[in-house]
């Protein structure tokens, strides 16, 4: 015998919500492993830069969403069909997912605050990487779709550190409308624009971080009260 | 070892028009910006314009822009410059250069070859 | 009249130091790219000689250097012989002007 009531549009809720949260991990599980395997990515690992081989943050960042992308999949199939299938063994499992993820969540935040410096410099190096794929390669429509990501999300185009080279590609090309790079190039600068976002806006990372855990503590709450009410169902 | 070697030169009346073509060989031409640089009698270098590996970015300086039209065939190693609308002063020594990224300027060059725009 | 300002002509004994100057501005050697010079030798393609301001490609002798100054780069040649006697140009890149710029050139020539 099933749930009922109350508990049945919990159990429901909860499938609907981890439904989406394992898409969303397909997604980004499928976009870093394109942009891992790409053929015109894979040619980053041998890149030279004049005599000096680049360096590999762009592939650490990939590898991160991966792991994400595969987090968020997994944690996302225990919720759907624990829900679904009103298993208490799984939610047992997506409830200790999700208890973990939280612990890792805070972790990270503190962190991710006592090493914003260095995160900023991997992000500008990672924002580097792809516009230098992109440019040197202009078939690596992965890079493309990376730096216009930045571009657009942070209202930047290129930096003060630019080559010659990707100045008059981003000038042509790659520029969000309305931003001149030429004109502005240091008010319009992307290295700008992140260190700007690690300090003077680190409250919208925070935000970001506490809708999670809100989100997190949410549906552990549900995922509980879901198990007790199966226990209790299936006494009767 | 890199060579790049121009040809299509020539003297051609003004409003007329010209093919360049650069053969390349000794590197990996398809992996390479290339660009065309020229010299008039006289005069200093000037660069004229630069195509990516696989043809996507193209620019050009602003006073042939409309006219000249940049191209490559990666399959046979080949660099062009159409020029149209030919003027007095699009006389000069045409010279195929590739565009190094890592060191941000022309590292290797060819010859050269002569246009002369004249009635 | 180029964008980067060179003398037309230089020229010194054997062994001698010669220096080569090269005048830009705010939009091209000032705002950060680098200067980069090419040698030409009478009958021959333009060879890169120096990059960013003061790398030498392999194969390029030490008694050429180049360095940078605000808006100005020079190239130096120290030991200066016969075989040095070419035409020398400075490259840089200009963002008003949204491309590659050159230098006059400057004719050296090796006395005696």
């Known amino acids: 015998m099933g749930v009922e009531g109350c508990t049945k549009c919990i159990k429901y809720l909860l499938f609907v919500f981890n439904f989406v949260f394992w898409l969303a991990g397909g997604v980004i599980l499928g976009v870093a492993l394109w942009l891992r395997h790409d053929p015109q990515t894979t040619n980053l690992l041998y890149l030279e830069l004049g005599d000096k081989p680049a360096p590999n943050t762009f592939y650490v960042g990939i590898y991160i969403l991966i792991a994400v992308g595969a987090v968020m999949m997994f944690v996302g199939f225990l919720g759907c069909y624990g829900a679904i299938q009103e298993s208490q063994c799984l939610l047992g499992t997506f409830f200790t997912c999700l208890v973990i993820l939280f612990a890792c969540e805070v972790a990270a935040g503190i962190w991710g605050f006592v090493n914003k410096d260095q995160i900023a410099k991997d992000v500008k190096q990672f924002y580097d990487q792809a516009l230098q794929q992109a440019v040197v390669d202009d078939d690596a429509n992965n890079a493309k779709a990376v730096v216009k990501t930045f571009h657009e999300t942070l209202d930047c185009c290129g930096s003060s550190t630019l080559t010659a080279l990707t100045t008059s590609v981003l000038k042509n090309n790659a520029c969000p409308s309305g931003s001149n790079i030429i004109s502005n190039l240091f008010k319009e600068d992307c290295h700008q624009k992140i260190d700007d976002l690690f300090s003077g806006k680190l409250y919208l990372i925070g935000i970001a971080a506490i809708v999670v855990a809100v989100i997190m503590i949410f549906e552990m709450i549900l995922s509980m009260v879901l198990c007790c009410g199966i226990r209790n169902s299936s006494v009767y | 070892e890199v060579q790049l070697l121009e040809s299509g030169g020539g003297l051609v009346q003004p409003g007329g028009s010209l093919r360049l073509s650069c053969a390349a060989s000794?590197?990996?031409?398809?992996?390479?910006?290339m660009s065309w640089v020229r010299q008039a009698p006289g005069k200093g270098l000037e660069w004229v314009s630069y195509?990516?590996?696989?043809?996507?970015?193209?620019d050009y300086a602003d006073s042939v822009k409309g006219r000249f039209t940049i191209s490559r065939d990666n399959s046979k190693n080949t660099l062009y410059l159409q020029m149209n609308s030919l003027r007095a002063e699009d006389t000069a020594v045409y010279y195929c250069?590739?565009?190094?990224?890592?060191?941000?300027?022309?590292?290797?060059w060819g010859q050269g070859t002569l246009v002369t725009v004249s009635s | 009249q180029s964008v980067l300002t060179q003398p037309a002509s230089a020229s010194g004994t054997p062994g001698q130091r010669v220096t080569i100057s090269c005048t830009g501005s705010?939009?091209?050697?000032?705002?950060?790219?680098?200067t980069h010079w090419y040698q030409r030798l009478p009958g021959t393609a333009p060879k890169l000689l120096i990059y960013?301001?003061?790398n030498r490609p392999s194969g390029v002798p030490d008694r050429f250097s180049g360095s940078k100054s605000g808006t100005s780069a020079s190239l130096a040649i120290s030991g200066l012989r016969s075989e040095d006697e070419a035409d020398y140009y400075c490259q840089s890149y200009d963002t008003n002007l949204s491309g590659w710029v050159f230098g006059g050139g400057t004719k050296l020539t090796v006395l005696g």
């Open positions: 960013g301001n003061s």
């Open positions: 705010t939009s091209n050697i000032g705002a950060g790219y680098g």
């Open positions: 250069a590739r565009y190094s990224y890592g060191r941000d300027n022309f590292d290797y």
């Open positions: 195509i990516s590996s696989s043809s996507t970015y193209t």
């Open positions: 000794g590197f990996t031409f398809s992996s390479n910006y």
